[in-house]
Interface confidence: low
């Protein structure tokens, strides 16, 4: 069951062991996965964490985690809790990991279970995360992960260099194997010189790249860039402006669950991402990507829930001029603020639309099944599914994605009710951007 309100960092789960004990496996991927430099960094962090673990106090934990005094509670076996559990802060209880969200593989004295790995794009999930086993991810067909670059799956070569024959196929953990025809010795795996390449598909490391190709590529890129800038200014400017004029950058989900390292900064809206990537094709520093809210926004009106009620059903003409955006009233994290409202959605969205809505939002049937199994009761099912959606999508889980999905399903009344509820609760308010006045 979802542990609501749990926002203590997962890192604080490691604490000094009472004695030698089995080490927790961080991931369950076949083959090496962690860069060697990262191992050193992690080791250093763990040393710091274990040294400072004594400083963790009740204030560090959300109220829901503080165990009230209770008599005759079951105690961990020799100071350790079994796989699928972690130890409570007072060291007297074993608390279960959450199925599909976190896990522990051995008897342990972790204060928090380890977060489940989420397979990257380009990977397939061989087996899901359980409370006692991490997700097992594997590179997709035609790609592999090697020791030198365990962070990502690389495309397998499509053929061997001249004078070599293929003796091993592409597997998720190795590239094709080539040996010299005469000697039978293995090829080192380095990319062969261009003129040696026998077969290769464009885009693979072994693909030939002539000077004329570079010139054509640069020319095409320049033309595309000019066209893109023009299109942005003329057609998409109005759509993007509200974001540039002060919407909080998306951030978030449940802080314990969402792996922030895998999130793109400022991924609040696809349109914005597309335009940023067109206008700034090179690497953009994070602080530039973050869309800051101006102290005194020009052409932007903040409306309180009361003032905004008359705007709930605007004319289509006005809708084309303005994009009314719901933003947290207290300038908090949009996804986290939305998450706090999930409890009430079960009463606002018809039961028959729960599963279609979650599919529309991107949950797989198996994830929906797991959520239903985890839910405390019938009414809790939508909450659990929405939490799964937030954990899965991170920053992309915005209030607008949810409202748009309801609109697409034809649940306009539910959409309206949720919008009203978000406003009347005081948690959200409208950020009203007038495209024309702001452009000038």
């Amino acid at each position: 069951m979802e542990q609501r309100g749990q926002n203590a960092p997962a890192a604080s789960g490691a604490r000094k062991r009472h004695g030698p004990g089995p080490r927790e496996a961080r991931g369950a991927r076949p083959g090496p996965r962690v860069p060697k430099t990262l191992v050193l960094v992690v080791a250093a962090v763990l040393l710091l964490v274990s040294a400072e673990s004594a400083l963790i106090t009740q204030q560090d934990l959300a109220p829901q985690q503080r165990a009230a005094p209770q008599q005759k509670r079951s105690s961990p076996s020799e100071g350790l809790c079994p796989p699928g559990h972690h130890i409570s802060e007072d060291g007297r209880d074993c608390i279960s990991c959450k199925y599909g969200q976190d896990y522990s593989t051995h008897w342990n004295d972790l204060l928090f279970c380890l977060r489940c790995t989420r397979c990257d794009s380009g990977e397939v999930e061989l087996s899901p995360c359980t409370t006692t086993r991490n997700t097992v991810c594997q590179c997709e067909e035609g790609t592999f992960r090697e020791e030198d670059s365990p962070e990502m799956c690389r495309k397998c070569r499509t053929g061997c260099p001249r004078g070599m024959v293929k003796v091993g196929d592409c597997t998720p953990w190795s590239d094709i194997e080539c040996v010299h025809k005469e000697s039978g010795t293995k090829h080192s795996g380095e990319v062969p010189a261009v003129e040696e390449t026998v077969t290769s598909s464009p885009g693979t490391p072994a693909s030939p790249c002539s000077l004329s190709g570079i010139i054509i590529g640069v020319t095409v890129a320049a033309v595309v860039l000019i066209v893109a800038v023009f299109v942005c200014k003329s057609l998409l400017w109005k759509k993007v402006l509200p974001y540039l004029k002060g919407i909080c950058s998306g951030g978030g989900g449940d802080p314990e669950r969402v792996d922030r390292s895998s999130q793109r900064p400022g991924a609040e809206d696809n349109v914005l991402n597309e335009i940023v990537s067109i206008l700034q094709p090179t690497q953009v520093p994070e602080q530039e990507m973050e869309v800051q809210e101006p102290a005194e926004p020009t052409g932007v009106n903040m409306l309180s829930p009361g003032e905004s009620e008359h705007l709930l059903e605007p004319a289509e003409a006005e809708r084309s001029q303005r994009r009314r955006l719901l933003v947290p009233a207290n300038e908090g994290d949009p996804t986290e603020t939305l998450r706090q409202c999930f409890d009430d959605f079960a009463d606002l969205v018809p039961f028959d639309s729960w599963e279609p809505l979650m599919r529309k939002l991107g949950l797989m049937d198996n994830e929906i099944k797991v959520a239903k199994a985890e839910a405390a009761g019938h009414r809790d099912t939508l909450y659990t599914m929405l939490i799964k959606w937030v954990n899965k999508t991170g920053r992309d889980a915005s209030v607008h994605t949810l409202l748009d999905a309801l609109e697409t399903l034809g649940e306009r009344l539910a959409k309206q009710k949720i919008e009203d509820h978000l406003l009347s609760s005081g948690k959200f308010m409208y950020l009203e951007g007038n495209a024309d006045s702001a452009m000038s």
Partner: nanobody, 122 residues
């Protein structure tokens, strides 16, 4: 006071079957995951099988296809049907339940039964 009471253990010949039961009693609000663990003499306690409230199951590789875990939520009872038993299945089998008590809000406390001995021998 929450109690887990196991039953059904005993002596059985290799290839035979046994059905273990575990009943939860006492005052509590909800049982989350339930599972069976086993501990052979001189070894660690290992997970045998686990089941969520909705019936999603997870088994140790060594028992897959031979053991079946099930539960009756209305009776707060857990079962383990053990078929094709082998001598290496000999162990004390412990019932485990993650129980929600009101004082803990959304934190489940881990409770154990006293254990029931299963001996597989000819």
């Amino acid at each position: 006071e929450v109690q887990l009471l196991e039953s059904g253990g005993g002596l059985v010949q290799p290839g035979g079957s046994l059905r273990l039961s575990c009943a939860a009693s006492g005052t509590f609000d909800k049982i989350n995951n339930m599972g069976w663990y086993r501990q052979a003499p001189g070894k660690q306690r290992d997970l045998v099988a686990q089941i969520t409230p909705g019936g999603i199951t997870d088994y140790a590789d060594s028992v897959k296809g031979r053991f079946t875990i099930s539960r009756d939520n209305s009776k707060n009872t857990l079962y383990l049907q053990m078929n094709s038993l082998r001598p290496e299945d000999t162990a004390v089998y412990y019932c485990n339940a993650e129980i929600l008590k009101r004082a803990y809000i959304d934190v489940y406390v881990n409770y154990w039964g006293q254990g029931t001995l299963v001996t597989v021998s000819s």
